[in-house]
Interface confidence: medium
């Protein structure tokens, strides 16, 4: 009724001293490798010469911190960020930061990034959209309350308001250019 070699699970590492033989009822706890987090029970039990339980380690890391317009990242850059790691932003002059200066990797997802707004209320260039363009020549600075319009490329349909407006140093939500369904 004893159990022999420990079972192996992806990205899971057994804790404690390894033995050749485990007695019935004995439990072994696993921990997850870096970037991974235990999902459910973390141990296996020896019952009737077989191990029961299946520790599962899931990847909770993040990649590519969110891009923030008119800001740059001041923390060290990594190819992969463990859950709980924070990334700090700084606004380019003369922009002012609103929101949390840091984003955090939270179980595989980044928390919401800050915004960098012009304290005078002016806006930078309108945000680019996939498969569409603004109808006027883009400027580097736009006065408060000014607006621009988007148009979609051929065969794409515009969803949302084609006109966006500069308010409090931020552009309103731009439209999307969607590919029409082909029947």
């Amino acid at each position: 009724t004893d159990c022999l070699s420990l079972p192996s699970f992806e990205n899971a590492i057994p804790m404690g001293e390894k033995k050749d033989v485990y007695k019935a009822g004995e439990q072994v706890t696993y921990t997850c490798a870096t970037y991974y987090k235990m999902d459910g029970a973390s141990n296996v039990t020896c019952i009737n010469s077989r191990w029961t339980g299946r520790p599962t380690c899931r990847d909770t890391s993040c990649v590519n911190p969110p891009t923030v317009q008119n800001a740059y990242i001041v923390s060290r850059q990594m190819s992969k960020y463990p859950s709980g790691e924070r990334v700090r932003y700084q606004c380019r002059s003369p922009y002012e930061m609103f929101g949390d200066e840091e984003v955090m990797c939270l179980n595989g997802n980044w928390t919401e990034p800050p915004q960098c707004k012009d304290s005078t209320g002016k806006c930078g260039p309108p945000p680019p959209i996939d498969n569409g363009d603004i109808t006027s020549f883009p400027l580097s600075v736009y006065a408060p309350a000014s607006s621009v319009e988007y148009q979609c490329q051929n065969l794409y349909q515009l969803e949302g308001n084609k006109r966006i407006t500069c308010r409090n140093g931020q552009w309103s939500e731009p439209p999307k250019c969607l590919h029409p369904c082909v029947i």
Epitope: F98, D100, E101, E102, M104, L106, E112
Partner: antibody, heavy 117, light 107 residues
Framework: QVQLQESGPGLVKPSQTLSLTCTVS????????VYWIRQHPGKGLEWIGV???????EFNPSLKSRVTISKDTSKNQVSLKLSSVTAADTAVYYC???????????WGQGTSVTVSS | DIQLTQSPSSLSASVGDRVTITCKAS?????LHWYQQKPGKAPKPLIY???NLASGVPSRFSGSGSGTDFTLTISSLQPEDFATYYC??????????FGAGTKLELK
């Protein structure tokens, strides 16, 4: 460990300015934003405003004209000022630390403020 | 502005029950947070960003949802779980708002 503690007068006269201080320890105000939230007797929670780690502030639109939030990083203090108070401003006032995604992870124990002549 | 509607506003349940509290947003949101508050105490975070358990919160609490509909579930109610629960949202384009609360009472 992380702690926040609100302090200020428990009684304020109508039309006066309510002034509260949130003293923090266990973290730096240069790294975390701090919110002010209030709760009217027997009611739900109402966001007042926030001072971000960079020093910028944002307010509940319904209170914006009366609210000032500032911080003194060297003293580890965040202050709230609410002008022209009325009985409707009677509440328990809390400060809380920003966690990320505009959530709060640590809260002060709250300070009760009554507006009455 | 986005409004959060919690239901039910109050709920009677027994120890061991499975309890579900819902929070409905007036328009689609990305994240929702949940807090627990006991009388005379400050709120305590339970769940961040829809489904992430806050530090020290027992695994009987879970959160789910997306878009406009979110739920907080307590799989097996314990005596210390009787409290008021609030959902909360904030985005860069909307003020921070709380739901009106759900009071969980002993049946």
């Amino acid at each position: 460990q992380v702690q926040l503690q609100e302090s200020g007068p428990g009684l304020v006269k109508p039309s006066q300015t309510l002034s509260l201080t949130c003293t923090v320890s266990g973290f730096s105000l240069t790294n975390y934003g701090v919110y002010w939230i209030r709760q009217h007797p027997g009611k739900g929670l109402e966001w007042i405003g926030v001072v971000w780690s960079g020093g910028t502030t944002e307010f509940n639109p319904s209170l914006k004209s009366r609210v000032t939030i500032s911080k003194d990083t060297s003293k580890n203090q965040v202050s709230l000022k609410l002008s022209s108070v009325t009985a409707a401003d009677t509440a328990v006032y809390y400060c809380a630390r920003n966690f990320g995604n505009y959530a709060m992870d640590y809260w002060g124990q709250g300070t009760s403020v009554t507006v009455s002549s | 502005d986005i409004q959060l509607t919690q239901s039910p506003s109050s709920l009677s349940a027994s120890v061991g029950d499975r309890v579900t509290i819902t929070c409905k947003a007036s328009s689609s949101v990305t994240y929702l947070h949940w807090y627990q508050q006991k009388p005379g105490k400050a709120p305590k975070p339970l769940i961040y960003a829809t489904s992430n358990l806050a530090s020290g919160v027992p695994s009987r609490f879970s959160g789910s949802g997306s878009g406009t509909d979110f739920t907080l579930t307590i799989s097996s109610l314990q005596p210390e779980d009787f409290a008021t629960y609030y959902c909360q949202h904030r985005s860069s384009s909307n003020p921070l708002t709380f739901g009106a609360g759900t009071k969980l009472e002993l049946k």
